[in-house]
């Protein structure tokens, strides 16, 4: 995402529409207080950074209000008035979606549907990855809404689930992020378990954008 | 289907001021921002900006503030181009565009995928 | 701002053979690239966009690559319509376009 400019990586994420975070990574300034200096139109006065992160007591990015906004961030890391970086993205890009809520199982035989909150904007996958403890891999299927039907269940395995959002690559490009996962929760006989028991860890998730 | 036409030709002398209007039918007006680009004969494109049409909250590139406004009139889903103190460098061809892909935000996002057919303004003393 | 350069100014190719344009972006744009042909007297029409991703009715002779900072636009076999200016655009920040490649038929 960021090309280095004197030394300095950085990271955007503008999670669910409403957050931009910006994040550095500047090893020359590891002990250094750099400022985040943004403005959303290119003929305005920068503003600066009120609400900074920090990591071992110095400043590492910025979070930024940007409720539904499609703008171009313009922004410049200082030290002092030397700017070490200076960049323009447009945020819509870096989307990262909100993980999902609600999410609710109806099972009918050897199927069930996920539903969950479709959030308020579209150009999304809703994925739904599954297994039981037969499994060597999660299974995955996505729709564009969350309501999600996966067919050919054994009754009488456990199962867990785990559901996440996605940005559709075609629309937003490569540079996107996948929510967070749902918690995980396990079903057997169409009845919520508290685990399947007969896998004391489940192996990590396809992590396939 | 979509479809944005631009008003016609103009000819204005130094000094003066000229209105360009984009008409857009075929999608809800206020679900894409218009964004304004310019072509002077015989050379590249260059973005001016773009508007909000939720909002109609201009946004400028650098290099066309001050005399180039961007405007909304919702009601008749049209987005207008005004240049004031007009001057021979600004004789160009005029094109609104729209993005074609992101239907999350009212935005510009840079890939215009529908566009006007173009208005030629002459600047001539 | 983001430079954008083509080369060349200008091809001349015979029909059925392989047209290879070329951008420079003066910085990285990952993936933020799109192509566009524009005939005279027209406005530009979007080919590519994400720099390899084929816009829906785009005939599949058209193909992109690249990212970063260099990129390609592919002709597989040129045909007498596909004669326009081809213009590589950015998005990564607030778009800009290449100076165009002008494409003819010997």
């Known amino acids: 995402q960021g090309g280095a400019a004197e030394g300095v990586q950085i990271q955007i994420i503008y999670f669910n529409l409403e957050t931009v975070q910006v994040t550095w990574n500047a090893s020359k300034y590891s002990r250094t207080n750099l400022t985040f200096h943004y403005r959303f139109n290119g003929d305005e006065a920068y503003d600066q950074c009120t609400n900074y992160l920090l990591q071992e007591g110095h400043t590492s990015g910025c979070l930024l209000d940007a409720e539904q906004r499609d703008d171009i961030l313009y922004f410049s890391i200082r030290n002092g008035t030397h700017p070490v970086f200076t960049a323009s993205r447009w945020m819509v890009y870096y989307l990262k979606p909100s993980s999902p809520k609600h999410v609710r199982f109806s099972w009918h035989q050897d199927a069930v549907t996920v539903t969950c909150s479709d959030l308020s904007y579209g150009d999304l996958l809703y994925e739904v990855q599954y297994r039981s403890p037969f499994d060597t891999e999660w299974q995955s299927k996505q729709e564009n809404t969350c309501n999600v039907t996966i067919e050919g269940l054994d009754a009488e395995k456990c199962y867990s689930f785990w559901v996440r959002v996605k940005a559709m690559e075609d629309v937003y490009g490569p540079d996107t992020y996948p929510s967070d996962w749902s918690e995980v929760t396990c079903w057997q006989r169409g009845e919520i378990r508290d685990a399947c028991a007969e896998t004391p860890t489940p192996p990590k998730p396809k992590l396939s954008k | 289907q979509v479809q944005l036409v631009q008003s016609g030709a103009e000819v204005k002398k130094p000094g003066a001021s000229v209105k360009v209007s984009c008409k857009a039918s075929?999608?809800?007006?206020?679900?894409?921002?218009i964004s304004w680009l310019r072509q002077a004969p015989g050379q590249g494109l260059e973005w001016m900006g773009w508007?909000?049409?939720?909002?109609?909250?201009?946004r400028y590139a650098q290099g066309f503030t001050g005399r180039f406004v961007f405007s909304l009139d919702t009601s008749v889903s049209t987005a207008y181009l005004q240049i004031s103190s007009l001057k021979a460098e600004d004789t160009a061809v005029y094109y609104c565009?729209?993005?074609?892909?992101?239907?999350?935000?009212?935005?510009?996002?840079?890939?215009?995928?529908?566009w006007g057919q173009g208005t030629l303004v002459t600047v001539s003393s | 701002e983001i430079v954008m350069t083509q080369s060349p100014a200008t091809l001349s190719l015979s029909p059925g053979e392989r047209a290879t344009l070329s951008c420079r972006a003066s910085?990285?744009?990952?993936?933020?690239l799109a192509w566009y042909q524009q005939k005279p007297g027209q406005p530009p029409k979007l080919l590519i966009h994400?720099?390899?991703t084929r816009v829906s009715g785009v005939p599949d002779r058209f193909s992109g690559s690249g990212s970063g900072t260099d990129f390609t636009l592919t002709i597989s076999s040129l045909q007498a319509e596909d004669v326009a200016v081809y213009y590589c655009?950015?998005?990564?920040?607030?778009?800009?376009f290449g100076q165009g490649t002008k494409l003819e038929i010997k």
């Open positions: 994400w720099a390899v």
């Open positions: 508007v909000n049409t939720n909002t109609g909250n201009p």
């Open positions: 075929g999608y809800t007006f206020t679900t894409y921002g």
């Open positions: 565009a729209r993005e074609g892909f992101i239907t999350t935000v009212v935005g510009a996002a840079g890939r215009f995928v529908y």
């Open positions: 910085q990285s744009v990952s993936s933020s």
């Open positions: 655009q950015q998005y990564s920040t607030y778009p800009t």
